[in-house]
């Protein structure tokens, strides 16, 4: 009978050896068989499972001239960069006729210095604020004992006696480095060194100190900054009358915020050149040599109403007997609030001043006392908001109306050039 066809007679004349090494090692397993007739394909098994994508090479050498003579078959399995998943029991398998033959096993083991699965990462933390760092290492061989170091000083008296996978740091007041050592029977591996940068705590209690129509004074309480003094604080403000949802500090505003730096102390800043009667959102962050704190949440604030900055424009006043007709236009100067109405005052040369609230109308007909013979009658008009009256116009003389003539218009205020919308900030 041809060799290898009987179950009790294995064709294998060389079985896989053993490989034990550290991660990354390259090694080769080899098995050899002698068969009569056409050489079979050699398969490799790991832990009883066929390796479909094995990096194997098969060499066949005939021992005679005839195809039916014996052949030596050598199969080599190459393991490149040994990993934990490569470990196990390896065997060669061949099918000869209706029989299956399996070689004696060889073993691949991994044993070396600890290997880090997780290492501490660089991060920033607020001063005196707790945080956690992670470190995880494995063998084989196990066990692996960890020793954490802070600024190269061990945090426990010996490996395995302190925190292992997770280090809880109750807080730092200076930028520090952390690493961990992993110890096993083969030696020591040291992780990367993580730098933990200590930033100032978020400022607290951002609040308004005082409000004026074009100016807000704000103050805040600085957070702890460890051993690093604060160098400055940065205040951001944004117009919030577009209904943005930044009250809770969630999204950043869609437009670029206006930014100002404050020297510290004092932890206070006056914001000038603001729009009156306008909602804003403000926030603050403070900076040390190590970097900036996180921003406070956006604080909604609002400038109060002011009085109109100029008098009504284009006042005309004409007299027809005992009646006087006065009309005007809204002030061109900023109203600094919601216009509530106009006040009008008229006075003759020797008569007391008469004051009237016209409301929001921009014209009025006056019934003059007597026969209308009062001389040198003049009229003044002022706009007002909830904050009070704006400036009065210059007195406008009441001129007799001549039919067919246009009513006189008194341009008593120089018309300012209308500037483009701008933010002259503090």
């Amino acid at each position: 009978a041809p060799r290898g066809t009987q179950a009790e007679e294995s064709p294998f004349v060389g079985n896989p050896g053993n490989i034990t090494g550290a991660r990354g090692l390259t090694g080769t397993l080899r098995c050899q068989l002698q068969v009569q007739g056409e050489p079979p394909e050699v398969h490799w098994l790991r832990d009883g499972q066929i390796l479909e994508l094995a990096d194997s090479t098969q060499t066949q050498v005939p021992l005679g001239e005839d195809e039916q003579d014996d052949w030596i078959v050598v199969s080599q399995l190459r393991i490149t960069s040994l990993q934990l998943s490569d470990t196990g029991q390896y065997q060669c398998l061949v099918f000869l006729g209706h029989q299956t033959f399996v070689s004696q096993p060889g073993y691949v083991g991994l044993e070396g210095l600890p290997y880090f699965l997780e290492e501490p990462e660089d991060r920033t933390v607020a001063a005196n604020t707790p945080f956690n760092l992670s470190c995880q290492a494995q063998g084989p061989p196990e066990p692996v004992d960890l020793l954490w170091l802070q600024d190269a000083v061990p945090l426990a008296t010996a490996p395995g006696h302190g925190p292992q996978r997770s280090l809880h740091v109750p807080g730092l007041n200076k930028t520090s480095s952390f690493s961990c050592e992993a110890h096993n029977a083969k030696g020591v591996t040291t992780s990367r060194t993580a730098t933990i940068t200590v930033l100032p705590q978020q400022p607290r209690n951002l609040h308004l100190v005082s409000r004026q129509p074009t100016e807000l004074e704000v103050a805040w309480t600085p957070g702890l900054s460890g051993i690093y003094p604060l160098t400055h604080c940065t205040l951001q403000a944004v117009l919030s009358d577009d209904g943005m949802g930044i009250q809770a500090g969630e999204p950043d505003p869609p437009e670029e915020p206006l930014t100002s730096q404050a020297s510290v102390p004092p932890h206070q800043l006056r914001l000038g050149s603001l729009h009156p009667h306008t909602p804003y959102h403000i926030r603050v962050a403070c900076t040390s040599s190590q970097g900036p704190s996180s921003w406070t949440h956006w604080l909604p604030v609002e400038t109060p109403e002011g009085v109109p900055l100029g008098p009504p424009e284009n006042i005309s006043a004409t007299r027809n007997g005992s009646q006087a007709f006065v009309h005007w236009q809204e002030p061109r100067a900023p109203l600094q609030g919601t216009l509530l109405g106009y006040r009008l005052a008229y006075q003759g040369q020797d008569t007391p001043e008469v004051l009237m609230d016209i409301g929001l109308r921009q014209e009025v007909t006056l019934e003059l006392q007597g026969d209308g013979s009062v001389s040198n009658l003049t009229v003044c008009v002022a706009a007002y908001t909830a904050a009070g009256d704006g400036p009065w116009s210059l007195p406008v003389p009441l001129e007799a109306w001549r039919p067919g003539e246009a009513q006189p218009v008194h341009q008593l205020v120089k018309e300012p050039s209308t500037p483009a919308f701008s933010w002259p900030w503090w």
């Epitope: 066990p143 490996p159 006696h161 110890h183 030696g187």
Partner: antibody, heavy 113, light 107 residues
Framework: QVQLQESGPGLVKPSETLSLTCTVS????????WGWIRQPPGKGLEWIGY???????SYNPSLKSRVTISRDTSKNQFSLKLSSVTAADTAVYYC???????WGQGTLVTVSS | DIQMTQSPSSLSASVGDRVTITCRAS??????LRWYQQKPGKAPKLMIS???NLAAGVPSRFSGSGSGSDFTLTISSLQPEDFATYYC?????????FGQGTKVEIK
Amino acid sequence: QVQLQESGPGLVKPSETLSLTCTVSGYSITSNYWGWIRQPPGKGLEWIGYITYSGSTSYNPSLKSRVTISRDTSKNQFSLKLSSVTAADTAVYYCAITTFYYWGQGTLVTVSS
Amino acid sequence: DIQMTQSPSSLSASVGDRVTITCRASQDIGNYLRWYQQKPGKAPKLMISGATNLAAGVPSRFSGSGSGSDFTLTISSLQPEDFATYYCLQSKESPWTFGQGTKVEIK
């Protein structure tokens, strides 16, 4: 398999120096920390000190003036020397890895003239 | 030095009993505490590390609790092989110090 084995004289005269060696197999002493613990007959355990993988040492202050722990990495051994011994130093001396997964079996050292 | 006080110094119990041994540190040691079992003529064996972590190969009937200065070793159901002396050890700072031991005997 990790094994630790203490060796040294079982009898030491008073005022002399007690010397013990711990031979470690299956674990490199250039990793982890390695210590000595003793136990007087019928009493509790007392920590003597340790040597680190890098060769630095830490000793029990009550013994510090008399104790030296050293190592020989080429032989994978570390040693204990305790000078000026008295009868109070009679004890079973254990060597161990400081995680205490692995211990020697202990050796009784008697201090007697 | 940190003093470790174990109680009781000895106790008698029967197989199946629940046994509790306490260890008190003279100052806060966090969770830097270990428990050992020692049988006559043998080296101690690590049972619990980090106050609560069961060492490899130790039966689950053993458990550790506590943090700071008060610690407990509990054997939920005493077995014949558990009769031994138990020691606590603090490794928070040098010198490491052991408790004086608790001998668990058969009633």
